[in-house]
């Protein structure tokens, strides 16, 4: 009679993570008598996957009833496959021996490859806010996918970005892979409502890519523009001066009025109005009693926005020696304004 052969008909098997892998194996003869064992790997370090005789193999079931005397089908199923199960599996026939069974013949091996979905992409932006016209970097990471081939794209408000670098690790063979990409984005004043999207496409996703997003509202700082104006006189000796703080983001803002360099009042932006682009406007006013001043008054609106160095705008009020002769509308005069940083 011809010597027993161990047939593993499948050179390779591809299984999605979470599914069950079927590893096929048949023997061509019932002789010699002895058990079948399944191993992962062929060397001395090979791992025991299933032993017909004894052992605990909770994830493994046999395809046919191995207790039947004429059974020659030694195929197994391995449940709940993960990328860590990848490797080459061998069906090995042992000959009954004393005290130990002796390895008789091995199948050619079946390589199990695992398809695993990438994790949801996580997009992270810079640690500190940046102002318009600056370039900032965003990173996108996704892990645990197999096979290695993967496509990553970046978008800003639906427009594809081209300035990015992507790495897939490791370079060599592995049970699963990770992707890391860094994109450069130039900020504009209109980006408060903008979104950066990282899109990952992989064979396991069946054409439905995964997306990770970052809101530029977490990244951008739009500094305010200031305008100080003098309102018509409310009473003969009072002038109303307003400071318009426009187009700023985020809302965190503190304003200080200075009269001739001395602090007059400090307030925090509260009742702001929101612009269509997501930036904010705010207005503060100061009532100046002109009669209390013998000389000209320099009014300064000083704004500290989001912890940045203060920005200010000044306005000069001329105090006339003969206010009655000027008329009620000219009790104070705007003689120009300037914007400066105070460090």
């Amino acid at each position: 009679e011809e010597e027993l052969q161990v047939i593993q008909p499948d050179k390779s098997v591809l299984v999605a993570a979470g599914e069950t892998a079927t590893l096929r194996c048949t023997a061509t003869s019932l002789i010699p008598v002895g058990p079948i064992q399944w191993f992962r790997g062929a060397g001395p370090g090979r791992e025991l996957i299933y032993n017909q005789k004894e052992g605990h193999f909770p994830r493994v079931t046999t395809v046919s009833d191995l207790t039947k005397r004429n059974n020659m089908d030694f195929s197994i199923r391995i449940g709940n496959i993960t990328p860590a199960d990848a490797g080459t599996y061998y069906c090995v026939k042992f000959r009954k021996g004393s005290p130990d069974d002796v390895e008789f013949k091995s199948g050619a091996g079946t390589e199990l490859s695992v398809r695993a979905k990438p994790s949801a992409p996580v997009v992270s932006g810079p640690a500190a806010r940046a102002t318009p016209q600056h370039t900032v970097s965003f990173t996108c990471e996704s892990h645990g996918f197999s096979p290695r081939d993967i496509t990553l794209k970046w978008f800003k408000n639906g427009n594809e970005l081209s300035d990015f670098q992507t790495n897939v690790d490791p370079v060599g063979e592995s049970v699963s892979y990770s992707i890391h990409s860094t994109a450069k984005v130039v900020l504009t004043r209109e980006d408060v409502h903008s979104q950066v999207i990282c899109e990952v496409a992989h064979v396991t996703l069946q054409g439905d890519p995964l997306r990770g997003t970052a809101n530029l509202s977490e990244t951008i700082r739009v500094p305010p523009t200031l305008e100080v104006t003098q309102q018509p006189v409310r009473a003969e000796n009072q002038v109303n001066v307003t400071c318009q703080v426009r187009k700023f983001y985020p809302q965190r803002l503190q304003l200080t009025w200075l009269e001739n360099g001395n602090v007059s009042r400090t307030e925090t932006a509260s009742t702001v109005t929101e612009n269509k682009d997501g930036t904010y406007n705010w207005m503060s006013w100061l009532l100046v009693n002109v009669s209390a001043h013998r000389d000209d008054v320099k009014l300064t609106c000083q704004v500290e926005h989001d912890g940045q160095p203060a920005v200010s705008k000044s306005h000069d009020l001329k105090v006339s020696a003969h206010p009655k002769e000027q008329g009620s509308n000219t009790a104070a005069e705007n003689t120009g304004s300037n914007e400066r940083n105070i460090y």
């Epitope: 790997g41 370090g45 791992e47 130990d100």
Partner: antibody, heavy 117, light 108 residues
Framework: DVQLVESGGGVVRPGESLRLSCAAS????????MTWVRQAPGKGPEWVSL???????YYADSVKGRFTISRDNSKSTLYLQMNSLRAEDTAVYYC???????????WGLGTLVTVSS | EIVLTQSPGTLSLSPGERATLSCRAS??????LAWYQQKPGQAPRLLIY???SRASGIPDRFSGSGSGTDFTLTISSLQSEDSAVYYC??????????FGGGTKVEIK
Amino acid sequence: DVQLVESGGGVVRPGESLRLSCAASGFTFSNFAMTWVRQAPGKGPEWVSLVSVTATTYYADSVKGRFTISRDNSKSTLYLQMNSLRAEDTAVYYCAKITWNNLFDYWGLGTLVTVSS
Amino acid sequence: EIVLTQSPGTLSLSPGERATLSCRASQTVGSKLAWYQQKPGQAPRLLIYDSSSRASGIPDRFSGSGSGTDFTLTISSLQSEDSAVYYCQQHNDWPPYTFGGGTKVEIK
């Protein structure tokens, strides 16, 4: 969690014997090959011996005929019987679990064997 | 028996710097080369296998490359906790499994 705890080390004279044990937990011991690796003071690791899942044994040339590796799957314990010890056997002896592709993925903390006259 | 030669013997670098460790095999091992990290008083810990695959839980500042006989372990930005001895090991051939002599990485 995988844990490997070695015991049995100590100080012996040249020519004497010692038996090391390694108690394993946190994985199905019988399904994996196990190995002993030693490290002499200030030197790199040196592979000593391996026992496969089918109880086949392998040895480094430097210990062949003097050391015997064995396993007791019912106790999840690995052993190394060391006979005819020499000064050059002085080292920390680690037991390690081997993966199917010959990686030493988990190691014990080691047990010190000193052979000195 | 495959002999693994590591260089340099010692590498002294500052935190944040890039460390490049080399391992050369006396004959080809394909991509079957692993790297281990050993800190004083501890057992070696598997870092990299199959030349470039990171073991479970290993930070991505550790990366491996190479095939055949020449291999490199790179630590992209050294941290104080990376101070250790690093060993390469071939897992291509059957016993004996051989290790390199090690490279000591010191943080200035």
